[in-house]
Amino acid sequence: KIDACKRGDVTVKPSHVILLGSTVNITCSLKPRQGCFHYSRRNKLILYKFDRRINFHHGHSLNSQVTGLPLGTTLFVCKLACINSDEIQICGAEIFVGVAPEQPQNLSCIQKGEQGTVACTWERGRDTHLYTEYTLQLSGPKNLTWQKQCKDIYCDYLDFGINLTPESPESNFTAKVTAVNSLGSSSSLPSTFTFLDIVRPLPPWDIRIKFQKASVSRCTLYWRDEGLVLLNRLRYRPSNSRLWNMVNVTKAKGRHDLLDLKPFTEYEFQISSKLHLYKGSWSDWSESLRAQTPEEEPTGMLDVWYMKRHIDYSRQQISLFWKNLSVSEARGKILHYQVTLQELTGGKAMTQNITGHTSWTTVIPRTGNWAVAVSAANSKGSSLPTRINIMNLCEAGLLAPRQVSANSEGMDNILVTWQPPRKDPSAVQEYVVEWRELHPGGDTQVPLNWLRSRPYNVSALISENIKSYICYEIRVYALSGDQGGCSSILGNSKHKAPLSGPHINAITEEKGSILISWNSIPVQEQMGCLLHYRIYWKERDSNSQPQLCEIPYRVSQNSHPINSLQPRVTYVLWMTALTAAGESSHGNEREFCLQGKAN
């Protein structure tokens, strides 16, 4: 049978549990015939504090006075050392250093729900470092008392397991908590309360929302509450918002009308409850209800723009473009756009519903006066139509904005500036700045962007759909009644030297001069707006500097004549392209020998 102290004892005076700062006397004594075998004077008793030797003595017992022990547990071990043998463990003792409990503070009690049980919390104060038992006492009317003990390491909460009922809501109850350990005890100040003070209702449940006649303006929130609830507070917000709208209601009886919700918006709703105007506490917020409000017919009007393209002597192509309504204007899912095209004099009208696009192209005669109307429709109705008379937007030269410039403005922005037209500037009703990626061949499928500017503005920052190293064709229109004037410019937000030069695809001889033709540089290699092409030539096998001819860049141009070559001399020719950032590398080299006579 194992006995940790069969050879002797360790005694501690005055107690194993001491107040911080106290002194203890530790005695280690051997039991009879448990010393060293030969001569008792050879007994060497050693006292250890944890693993550190603090005292020793020859004989059957050892006394040691110990001071300055820290808070917590200290282990003392007594060992016997005999000559020519290992130390033998005699016995050990724990000494527990702590303090008496402080007075528990801020005792407060709560009953969660009318059917819940009373539970109290308090602040323990500083750690006693000892086992401290807490006893919670509750006394009520008719000398009723309840008591509960807490035996956990850290105790600052106890549930009585009893339920206060609303029979006499004004009856007083008093709670008190007492902390006890080996060094003392302390009680909190009493906390007195009534049923109404401490019952915290359960959060509302079964929250629902109803929209009468599927209308956002006739919306009622329903919920269920415990029976005694008098007050509610509602909070709600769009799901993408951080700010709550708050409403306080009295005697709502589980329903409330909401009047300020936006259509076609997902909202989050929560409700909290209270039993009394100024007593007790609010419940936790209910679980969230998420619900989408019904659609309403769109408000606002579409921003519509158009492009005209000449097809032949009798026909023209009209491309209409419009911007999506904002979420707050659409007030629902836009199902289609209705486009109506009408010849104003003859009265012929054509209506078409467009789904999935924000553009429409048609071909109309070049004669007659044409107008379009475009509106957006959701399940509840249509927006007011935007009406536009189709005119030649650039016809009035005197309305053309002057001195148009386009400059890079930070990352992926272009600042467009202009001067008002020469014609009475006050006649301008608005400016429209239009931009689209420059594509040789003027591809009408390229997306069109535009913004409207007030008549007193002479600049606009364009940033939508602007990419670095892409050249944009920018037009500024001045509109006045049924007239328009325009000016255009090329611009980019960021540029560098083109990645390649033009590819010469043909050199032909015409009356003593040559005509060079080339393929355009692919758009993705232009790296911005091209300013010039350069054609270089030199005699083959010559070390002289090449001659060059610089041609201003024009979108549609892809050939140029040179008439300064000598006949019957073989030349090497190549081309480069330039942006404002620099010159490209050489394109391909072609050799050519002019056959005709020199001029």
Epitope: I2, H16, T73, E94, Y131, K151
Partner: nanobody, 125 residues
Framework: QVQLQESGGGLVQPGGSLRLSCAAS????????MAWFRQAPGKEREFVAV????????YYADSVKGRFTISRDDAKNTVYLQMDSLKPEDTAVYYC??????????????????WGQGTQVTVSS
Amino acid sequence: QVQLQESGGGLVQPGGSLRLSCAASRRTFSKHAMAWFRQAPGKEREFVAVVRWSGIITYYADSVKGRFTISRDDAKNTVYLQMDSLKPEDTAVYYCAAGDYRGNGYYVPGMYDYWGQGTQVTVSS
């Protein structure tokens, strides 16, 4: 997370002996106080014995002093309860517990963080 597994329970006649074992899953075992508690039907869980500091310190409930011996083998992460001179009133489910009691709270179940599932000891003729 320390897991504790008791074994060794069973039916024994009054005056007989049993040896309970409790194996711990982690080597942090040696840092903890290891205790045995028991719970008879309809009664609260009560302290039986505890061993701490690799066996230097032991405490026993008055009702078992001189009959039961607690010991531990830190190399095997195991604590033992040798029960001799068993009486019918020793009948209970015996639980092994590990933790670090504070002050003189070694006898309080709430001081211990980890518990085994328990093993039944029945003392009956």
